[in-house]
């Protein structure tokens, strides 16, 4: 079964995927594809990295974190209902049949009608604190729990945190990452 993530129409969706490079700059090819992970690589590739850089991407799909440190989490910009579905993150670890593959299910909800400008946005829904643990079968998950209640003054802080990938670093520091080497 796939790990499920949610976002609203018009928001940016965040699909986490991490590994720990054996050494700084010693990168591993990673691909993201729309659809479950196939037998090799990714189908319907939307983004791909090699040992040095992002070498293929399509519009609206980008890596917001520091992929040189193994944060290959996918951001999908301005999502629509058509973005719903399963996405594959495949970490192509060198060796014989060493790939790590993770299927993440993205559920897009219709945008909420906001009756008053003071209404809090549901950042928990857009960026659930979930992470993918090491596993050779179907992706396993751990839930770190909902983000604490946030007030308006904290929203910009959280937005900056997400943009700066500190949340991703927090997830990585939890130890639930793919370690190579």
């Amino acid at each position: 079964s796939e790990v499920e993530y949610r976002a609203e129409v018009g928001q940016n969706a965040y699909l986490p995927c991490f590994y720990t490079p054996a050494a700084p700059g010693n990168l591993v090819p990673v691909c993201w594809g729309k659809g479950a992970c196939p037998v090799f690589e990714c189908g319907n590739v939307v983004l791909r990295t090699d040992e040095r850089d992002v070498n293929y991407w399509t519009s609206r799909y980008w890596l917001n974190g520091d992929f040189r440190k193994g944060d290959v989490s996918l951001t999908i910009e301005n999502v629509t209902l058509a973005d719903s579905g399963i996405y594959c993150c495949r970490i192509q670890i060198p060796g014989i049949m060493n790939d790590e593959k993770f299927n993440l299910k993205l559920v897009i909800k219709p945008a909420k009608v906001t009756p008053a400008p003071t209404r809090q946005r549901d950042f928990t829904a857009a960026f659930p604190r979930m992470l993918t643990t090491r596993g050779h079968g179907p992706a396993e998950t751990q839930t770190l729990g909902s983000l604490p209640d946030i007030n308006l003054t904290q929203i910009s802080t959280l937005a900056n945190e997400l943009r700066d990938s500190r949340l991703a670093n927090d997830l990585r520091d939890s130890g639930a990452t793919i370690r190579i080497g």
Epitope: P29, A36, P38, V39, F40, N44, G95
Partner: antibody, heavy 117, light 107 residues
Framework: EVQLLESGGGLVQPGGSLRLSCAAS????????MSWVRQAPGKGLEWVSA????????YYADSVKGRFTISRDNSKNTLYLQMNSLRAEDTAVYYC??????????WGQGTLVTVSS | DIVMTQSPSSLSASVGDGVTITCQAS??????LNWYQQKPGKAPKLLIY???SIVSGVPSRFSGSGSGTDFTLTISSLQPEDFATYYC?????????FGQGTKLEIK
């Protein structure tokens, strides 16, 4: 012209070795996963092995694991299959094939490997 | 390993006929199903990928459908060059596996 051309097949005794080559042309070889697929005389298709574009990730069928080694030289646009400890059941036409978007979209003409005493 | 079962194993038809070949997977393979055509002494040729996407240059009389475990290849009006052996192949789970083939012969 986009094409794959295998070579290196022939007659070999059981327990012997052989190295197949597949020369690629007309496309960016290093960007593609490549595979070997075989077909025993009068039989169906059997996937044998695959390798990533950078050559660092390899994959094998259980029937050949530990005996066959796939490799590639991207500077020469060439794919290889080193076959050791050959058995009679390895007798087949061996095809190299390009893997793209979940399918084997380009195939060579094949090279026949016969394992017999 | 995922077992791919094709039916029928052989089929006789005439030019102009419509034929359907089925392929059943032993477990869910989403839409990761390919169809190949092979003529005697030749390499296989990819016709259909993702169960229903037709390869550029393949005549429109070929079509594929299905998802999950059950798939079909349909040739709407057979031409003389269509008589060959057809294979399905799953690309969902390791290792990739092929069906046993369906030989399409002239009646």
């Amino acid at each position: 012209e986009v094409q794959l051309l295998e070579s290196g097949g022939g007659l070999v005794q059981p327990g012997g070795s052989l190295r197949l080559s597949c020369a690629a042309s007309g496309f960016t070889f290093s960007s593609y996963y490549m595979s070997w697929v075989r077909q025993a005389p009068g039989k169906g298709l059997e996937w044998v092995s695959a390798i990533s574009g950078n050559g660092k990730s390899t994959y094998y069928a259980d029937s050949v694991k530990g005996r066959f080694t796939i490799s590639r030289d991207n500077s020469k646009n060439t794919l290889y299959l080193q076959m050791n400890s050959l058995r009679a059941e390895d007798t087949a036409v061996y095809y190299c094939a390009r893997y793209y978007n979940t399918g084997f979209d380009l195939w060579g003409q094949g090279t026949l490997v016969t394992v017999s005493s | 390993d995922i077992v791919m079962t094709q039916s029928p194993s052989s089929l006789s038809a005439s030019v102009g006929d419509g034929v359907t070949i089925t392929c059943q997977a032993s477990q869910d393979i989403y839409n990761y199903l390919n169809w190949y055509q092979q003529k005697p002494g030749k390499a296989p040729k990819l016709l259909i990928y993702y169960a229903s996407s037709i390869v550029s240059g393949v005549p429109s009389r070929f079509s594929g459908s299905g998802s999950g475990t059950d798939f079909t290849l349909t040739i709407s009006s057979l031409q003389p060059e269509d008589f060959a052996t057809y294979y399905c192949q799953q690309a969902s789970s390791f290792p990739p596996t092929f069906g046993q083939g369906t030989k399409l012969e002239i009646k």
